[in-house]
Interface confidence: medium
């Protein structure tokens, strides 16, 4: 699996979307679990309704949300307050017994340009800072990864 | 005119604590996200605190090398921003300066941590 | 972390020549919106840092027009058209668009 880049702002929302094929996972639970290490296992953080009929209705833990359309095939989850700590490799499964197929691997980066809060462009006149009220799901953005960039870089 | 100004700084033993301050004057304080910034002689700048506005409920990111130890904080109805240093080690010694990172940067104030 | 290099370190400038400055991330600096987070600064010696040039290619408010920034995703550079004696000092590449913030390690420029 390829790694998708997606990009969120620090204290704001991300939305994470995972697209698979509705038949061949037809009837299948999903989960969101974030990967330990370059070869660790991957923790669940949620997963969708026990009932995959109910599978459409969001599930919480913590600030992620999970939430699957069995029909048009979009496993979607959101980050709530976005924080550096959230940064890292996850994964979107679809699970089926003890066993887990990996839908899409992700990368979740947190950024923090300090001008976002500023008006638009302009560096000399600071402007209010939008409010989670404000903007339910900020901007993000996805990409696959770079040639030569790596999700896990070497620690010192 | 735009004026920070660091105090607190002084010579102190590692494990000690230590509080600096921050008064500002000039530019809309309230609204503008305000960070600490440090740098040791002859090394670049490393940023080590940062805080955001009332609107952003005042949410505060620290580097790794100080989390745990090291508090951000700021009084909006004094335009001042604070840092609270505990279990200070040798390392932490460098000028710290008060900053919003882009336009205003305050002249620093000399942490020493040495026995 | 992202880390900055920069290039060369030291760089020493006839009065009227241009400088080049380089500086290399190892991560995409591109963010949302299609901004680019890299900042320039100057230090001269005893002072605190001064904003050049934001978001990679914008001159900060009073900053003259001899200076200017450009780049990509991971590479960008500094360009001093006509060196003058007052630009004398260490510039610093900074990132603002992860935590935590990191700065490069310094360009000293010096006149001949």
């Known amino acids: 699996h390829n790694t998708t880049v997606f990009q969120g702002v620090a204290g704001q929302s991300l939305q994470v979307s995972c697209p698979y094929d509705s038949m061949k996972h037809w009837g299948r639970r999903k989960a969101w679990c974030r990967q330990l290490g370059e070869k660790g296992p991957c923790q669940r953080v949620v997963s969708t309704h026990n009932l995959w009929l109910l599978s459409f209705l969001r599930r919480w833990n913590g600030s992620t949300a999970i939430t699957d359309d069995t029909l048009g095939g979009t496993l979607t989850i959101t980050l709530r307050n976005l924080q550096p700590h959230d940064a890292g490799l996850y994964q979107c499964q679809s699970l089926h017994g003890s066993e887990a197929d990996t839908l899409r691997k992700v990368l979740v980066e947190v950024l923090a340009d300090p001008l976002d809060h500023r008006d638009a462009g302009d560096l000399w006149f600071p402007g209010e800072s939008e409010s989670f009220e404000d903007a339910h799901v900020e901007h993000s953005i996805s990409r696959s990864l770079l040639e030569g960039e790596i999700p896990f870089p070497p620690t010192s | 005119e735009v004026q920070l100004v660091e105090t607190g700084g002084s010579l102190v033993q590692p494990g000690k604590s230590l509080r600096l301050t921050c008064a500002t004057s000039g530019f809309p304080f309230s609204n503008v996200w305000l960070h600490w910034v440090r740098q040791s002689p002859e090394k670049h700048p490393e940023w080590v605190a940062h805080i955001k506005a009332k609107s952003d409920n005042y949410a505060t990111y620290y580097a790794e090398s100080v989390k745990g130890r090291f508090t951000i904080s700021r009084d909006d109805s004094k335009s001042s921003v604070f840092l609270q240093m505990n279990s200070l080690k040798e390392e932490d010694t460098a000028i710290y300066y008060c900053?919003?990172?882009?336009?205003?940067w305050g002249q620093g104030t000399l942490v020493t941590v040495s026995s | 972390d992202t880390v900055l290099t920069q290039a060369p370190l030291s760089v020493s400038v006839t009065p009227g020549e241009s400088a080049s400055i380089s500086c290399r991330s190892n991560k995409s600096l591109l963010g949302i919106r299609d901004i680019t987070s890299l900042y320039w600064y100057l230090q001269k010696p005893g002072k605190s840092p001064q904003l050049l040039i934001y978001?990679?290619?914008n001159l900060a408010s009073g900053v003259p027009d001899r200076f200017s920034g450009s780049g990509s995703e991971t590479d960008f550079t500094l360009k001093i058209s006509e060196v003058e004696t007052e630009d004398v000092g260490v510039y610093y590449c900074?990132?603002?668009?992860?935590?935590?913030?990191?700065f490069g390690p310094g360009t000293k420029l010096e006149l001949k």
């Open positions: 900074a990132q603002f668009l992860r935590y935590p913030y990191t």
């Open positions: 978001r990679m290619s």
């Open positions: 900053t919003d990172i882009l336009e205003y």
